[in-house]
């Protein structure tokens, strides 16, 4: 099949006092191979500080997955979600407040 780029959506939720959990979701992509990771100042976080979901079919012939990490509130600007799929890449910031940030990566 042809390549379908992912829709990337970054959300945030309060974790514990002074911390927030940021989650980066990629959906609607094909083929299933994808790189999705959190970066701090452009540097990938270590594996033990990130949680990944499995790459799963979403029922439309495409796939979805997610990655999450916990960060200190007030440091959001340092963090971005990095996505690489089929030779294309994109960077996604943490939204301010409780807003959601959508970005569709175009080939």
């Amino acid at each position: 099949g042809s390549t379908v780029p992912p829709m990337v959506n970054v959300t945030r939720s309060e974790a514990s006092e002074g911390n927030i959990t940021v989650t980066c979701r990629a959906s609607g992509f094909y083929p299933w191979n994808i790189t999705l990771s959190w970066r701090q100042d452009g540097v990938s976080l270590s594996h033990d500080t990130q949680q990944w979901g499995d790459v799963l079919p979403d029922g439309n012939g495409t796939y979805q997955t997610w990655v999450a990490t916990r960060i200190c509130q007030g440091e959001e600007q340092r963090f971005t979600c990095y996505m690489e799929h089929s030779g294309n890449h994109s960077t996604h910031p943490v939204p301010s407040g409780n807003s959601h940030h959508h970005h569709h990566h175009h080939h």
Epitope: D41, G42, V43, S44, S46, T49, T80, H89, P93
Partner: antibody
Amino acid sequence: EIQLVQSGAEVKKPGASVKVSCKPSGYAFTSNNIYWVRQAPGQGLEWIGYIDPYIGRIIYNQQFKDRATLTVDKSTSTAYLELSSLRSEDTAVYYCSRSGERSNFDYWGQGTLVTVSS
Amino acid sequence: EIVLTQSPATLSLSPGERATLSCSASSSISSNYLHWYQQKPGQAPRLLIYRTSNLASGIPARFSGSGSGTDFTLTISSLEPEDFAVYYCQQGGSLPLTFGQGTKVEIK
């Protein structure tokens, strides 16, 4: 091969501005942050700031926030550092560097000497 | 701001000797955020060790790094002529990103 090529040496008068360019090659320009660091003669390394070329986000060392401006031109895959209101203490070699997968500075430009003298 | 203090400022050794360089942080740093760079005269720094103990690409195995918390060490097991240079530690855990003042390894 990953390379970062910087513009040539500059001599400036106090109060003037200087703009240094950095052109990386060998990787996708927007996939890694570009950092800027300076080194005064015989001194250590001082971080100025970085820019994410994909989204244009800039983080400055507060010490340089008022005088440094980081920009990128995605059409030419070039990053720029502009430093204004130059003084003699700004005489230094200015380096650009690329953020790495596991460290802040994994490849460096050759450096640009900026001399501020009346 | 996390201040990194390197010691000694200068280390005078002969080729073949062991070099031990220290980097002390003013606040605790996760080992994931401590890196070492080598700089030779007239050249840009180059990444030597990342995340406390991992050798960067092309760096010989005589270099090693260790440490945790506030105390980190770079060791060169047997100095080669090309190892005489200035070495900097750097932390990426908190802003501003900071470097140590450097340790110069010179020929005795």
